[in-house]
Amino acid sequence: TPEVWVQVRMEATELSSFTIRCGFLGSGSISLVTVSWGGPNGAGGTTLAVLHPERGIRQWAPARQARWETQSSISLILEGSGASSPCANTTFCCKFASFPEGSWEACGSLPPSSDPGLSAPPTPAPILRADL
């Protein structure tokens, strides 16, 4: 069964700057990744970035840099200035659309006890939705 993992880290240098990393553990071909915050995409969440493996990347403030880390994982840096900046308990979600598995989404937030610069290991987060 495919799984999605989400890792959220607060940068030590900028306490209101976050890095979100997401990955897909499955054998299928990824066709699209959508990163949102405030809840799952399409369920109250606001899209931060959409990444297509070949067509390109679209991102919106406060996202600063979205990129593919590998063929099955992505990272997104959020800059934390202004009213739309994230806070420590913000939920971030990643939805991977893949063939033939369908869509798989997981969410994560900053670990409650984490110090700046530290992060939880990138273990698979609970899968919230699987649209097959």
């Epitope: 493996p53 067509r55 679209r58 593919w68 063929q71």
Partner: antibody, heavy 114, light 113 residues
């Protein structure tokens, strides 16, 4: 198949504003950004910016910041581009596009002339 | 901004012959993480909007004839039409799909010799 249908041609005076609409059908309007691109007569393509209709998040080409505004109405699947302080150099065909420029509207000719 | 430069500006090729258009970017369009090049090619005929032909430097958009092919990596890319047809007369544009703002080449006008 996504279809984008734009509003008709406009003739405007210098200093005025123009608002171009782009109605989408056949796809998920709020999931992908609507891009705006213009093409002056006999010239190349120039990206103006984009809006993500679901959240109204926008990105603008620095060249147009302060003069262009994007809005979107998800109830009618329509995106809008308003360009203000028009000058003769803004005479161009304005296109909306979606899904990484895979789908395009037919274009709207905006002529700025005194 | 990434500057896209196409060559030649215009090109005349006989029907059935090969047409080659080059595109050079001022910065690499290669995403090192997934080894994909974010470059697209468009065809525009008079009075029509551009039509996406190629994305990811080499992937043909659905419905595009297989005589169109894209190649290249990093900063140097090529669009090839293997056997020119009359309906291929148009202006062709390359586009940076790697970073904001998306920028286009100046265009290459393709005509029949």
């Amino acid at each position: 198949e996504v279809q984008l249908v734009q509003s008709g041609a406009e003739v405007k005076k210098p200093g005025s504003s123009v608002k171009v609409s782009c109605k989408a059908s056949g796809g998920t309007f709020s999931s992908f950004s609507i891009e705006w691109v213009r093409q002056a007569p006999g010239q190349g393509l120039e990206w103006i910016g984009e809006i993500l209709p679901g959240s109204n998040s926008t990105n603008y080409n620095e060249k147009f910041k302060g003069r262009v505004t994007f809005t979107a109405d998800t109830s009618t699947n329509t995106a809008y581009m308003e360009l203000s302080s028009l000058r003769s150099e803004d005479t161009a065909v304005y296109y909306c596009s979606s899904y990484w420029f895979a789908y395009w509207g037919q274009g709207t000719l905006v002529t700025v002339s005194s | 901004d990434i500057v896209m430069t196409q060559s030649p500006d215009s090109l005349a090729v006989s029907l059935g012959e090969r047409a080659t258009i080059n595109c050079k970017s001022s910065q690499s369009l290669l995403n090192s993480g997934n080894q994909k090049n974010y470059l697209a090619w468009y065809q525009q005929k008079p009075g029509q909007p551009p039509k996406l032909l190629i994305y990811g430097a080499s992937t043909r958009e659905s419905g595009v004839p297989d005589r169109f092919s894209g190649s290249g990596s990093g900063t140097d890319f090529t669009l090839t039409i293997s056997s020119l047809q009359a309906e291929d007369v148009a202006v062709y544009y390359c586009q940076n799909a790697h970073s904001y703002p998306p920028t286009f080449g100046q265009g290459t006008k393709l005509e029949i010799k």
